[in-house]
Each structure stands twice: as C-alpha cells, then as structure tokens.
C-alpha cells in the first residue's frame, strides 16, 4: 500500500493525524466498524493537546471513544497502552454502574458534555470520532 | 503484570470477625470493579460482593448481608472485606478478583469453635 | 435474582472427545455471561466473556455460544489438562450468580 499524505475529504487533519466527526449516533460497536470500514480506528487520545482539539470540534455533545473494557482490562483499539498512557476521566469514574436497568454494567468510554471522560453502555447511540495516522500505510494500491 | 494478592484469613470463633485484604498491582486500580468471591471446601464458586471502580456503589450476596462491608483504598490499590458475626457456612477460601477476569490465588477462612 | 441452571454437574470423556456444557439462566440475560476453568486448589481462570468471545490466551478449542437463557461452553478435542471444572457466571445484575460446576472426568 501506499503511504497517506493528506486527509481524505471531509477529515480534519491535525498533527500528523486525519480526524473524521460524526453527526449521527451508533452503539459503540457499529461506530467502531465504520471507522475500520474506513481505514481508520476510533480516536485515541494520547495527550491534553489531542483531548483538546477533539472537544473543540465535538462540542458539548457525548461522542465515542476508542476505549473499552469489554474483555476485561481497559482498552484502546489501536494498542496504545492505557495504564501508562494519557487519562481524563471525570471525578468518580469509570464506576461500571449497573442502575440504568439495561443489563450488564458500562464497558465503553465517551467524551461527555464538558469533554471529560465517562463509561456507560456501549449499546447507546451517541456521535463518534474517527481517527487515521497520516504517516499509517493506505490499504488502497498505489496508482500505476 | 496483573497481581492480586489476598491476605488476613485464619481460623475465627463463630460470632467473630476478619478483615480481609487484597493488595493489587500491574494495573490502574481505580478504573475496575472489584469483587470478593468465595467456596467452600469441596463446593461451588459464590460471588459475594462486588463494589464500583470509584464511586463506591456496593452490592452483596444475600447470605452475607449486614454481616459484611466491603471497601477500598483506591490511593494504597487495597480492596478489603470486613466480616462480622462469623458462621461456620462462613468458611471458604475467599478470592478477590478484578472485575470478571482477573483472579487472586485466595486466603481461607476457617470459622470454628 | 437469576438462578444458573448448569449441566451436566459431571462427565467422563477421553482424550480427543468433544464436550459440551450447558447453562440456562431463569431469564434473559442477553450476552453478559462468561465460562470459568478451575484447576483443584488454583484460582478460576476465564475463558470465554460475553457468552462467545475467547480470552486471549486460551486455545481456540475452547467455543462458546448462545445468548438470552440458553448457552453452552464446547471443548473440541479434549486435551489432558482438560480435565478439570467448569462454571459458568452471568454478571447481568446483581447478585451475579454462578453455575453449580460441571467436573469433566477421565473415562
């Protein structure tokens, strides 16, 4: 494959990274296979700056992460390691809660209203966030 | 690497009580749930009580509520179980565990007079 | 609270056989169900979360499946360290419940 030097359209790039933002809502699973359909992976926010710019352009609204602990230990979807890596969970969270009465506890991270991060049930259709390294080899062959 | 590692069982007079301890470690405590479950010699697996990553919501088996209270130090990566008014249907090993995935090797607890 | 009805409470089976163990929850509990492995004196170990999906680490002759109140745990081809116990855990709500065990034997 080819190496990616610009964004696709309607992709924000910022530092060295293409940014794709929703504006319909999916469960957690279903905006994760959009993101992989498009070559991408669901945004994973590796320091304040990156966590900034991406509430900047979501805006107060809940939106998908690429963090969950559906097997176990929290994850991010690309690998990057969570315990050593960036955090901004609000106060109190995560706390797993099980008392929305939908079954099961809350296994999926969102950015919520004031950016900071919560986990809830990844079957709630909220926004979601792609993300692509620009420097990551396209999966499109290259043009003769 | 994950670690949990239980200490504090022994053997008690019925009526008595133990603290339990789960010092826990290779991980971010104060993202998970942790859970407290026990069997009894030659018996089944029994979940016993379960509290939230932070805020503290905490749940318990019929058998041993208003018995049992079970806590965290999220600063000192501690989970412990306060057990009071001890029965003999008490005695098991007593497993802390990490949400529903990671378990520790457990402690026993004996309760005989 | 959700009782976990698991069967068979025993089996005997050989080296290269597929098992399987059932467990029926007494209502829906969508997917929120995992199987446990218990070596005698050792701590459980999980193999499977969200009633199909493999731990990592645990060989891929271990399956499961199902969702709502039935699922089953299969084991494709025994292997020696096979024989041991087996129980299934729903986490759907509290209090989380465990199957009684099923003891996979020798024949």
């Known amino acids: 494959g080819s190496e990616r030097t610009c964004c696709p359209v309607n992709w924000v790039e910022h530092e060295r990274s293409c940014y794709w933002f929703s504006r319909s809502g999916k469960a957690w699973a279903d905006a994760d296979n959009y993101c992989r359909l498009e070559d991408a992976h669901l945004v994973v926010v590796t320091s304040w700056e990156e966590q900034k710019f991406v509430q900047h352009h979501i805006g107060p609204v809940n939106t998908w992460m690429g963090l969950h602990d559906q097997n176990g230990p929290w994850k991010w979807v690309d690998g990057t390691d969570y315990e050593t890596g960036f955090k901004n969970w609000r106060p109190e969270q995560p706390d797993d809660w099980y008392g929305h009465g939908l079954g099961g506890g809350e296994d999926c991270a969102h950015f919520t209203d004031d950016g900071r991060w919560n986990d809830d049930v990844c079957q709630r259709p909220y926004r979601w966030v792609c993300e692509t390294e620009l420097d990551k080899a396209s999966q499109e062959p290259p043009l003769l | 690497e994950v670690q949990l590692v239980e200490s504090g069982g022994g053997l008690v007079k019925p009526g008595g009580s133990l603290r339990l301890s789960c010092a826990a470690s290779g991980f971010t405590f104060s993202s998970y749930r942790m859970n407290w479950v026990r069997q009894a010699p030659g018996k089944g697996l029994e979940w016993v009580s379960s509290i939230s990553s932070s805020t503290g919501y905490m749940y318990y088996a019929d058998s041993v509520k208003g018995r049992f209270t079970i806590s965290r130090d999220n600063a000192k990566n501690s989970l412990y179980l306060q057990m009071n008014s001890l029965r003999a249907e008490d005695t098991a090993v007593y497993f802390c565990?990490?949400?529903?995935?990671?378990w520790g090797q457990g402690t026993l607890v004996t309760v005989s007079s | 609270d959700i009782q976990m009805t698991q069967s068979p409470s025993s089996l005997s089976a050989s080296v290269g056989d597929r098992v399987t163990i059932t467990c029926r929850a007494s209502?829906?509990?969508?997917?929120?169900l995992g199987w446990y492995q218990q070596k005698p004196g050792k701590a459980p170990k999980r193999l499977i979360y969200a009633a199909s999906s493999l731990q990592n680490g645990v060989p891929s002759r271990f399956s499961g499946s199902g969702s709502g109140t039935e699922f089953t745990l299969t084991i494709s081809s025994l292997q020696p360290e096979d024989f041991t116990t087996y129980y299934c855990?729903?986490?759907?709500?509290?209090?989380?419940?465990f199957g009684q065990g099923t003891k996979v034997e020798i024949k």
């Open positions: 565990a990490r949400d529903k995935d990671y």
């Open positions: 855990l729903q986490h759907n709500s509290f209090p989380w419940t």
């Open positions: 209502q829906d509990i969508r997917n929120d």
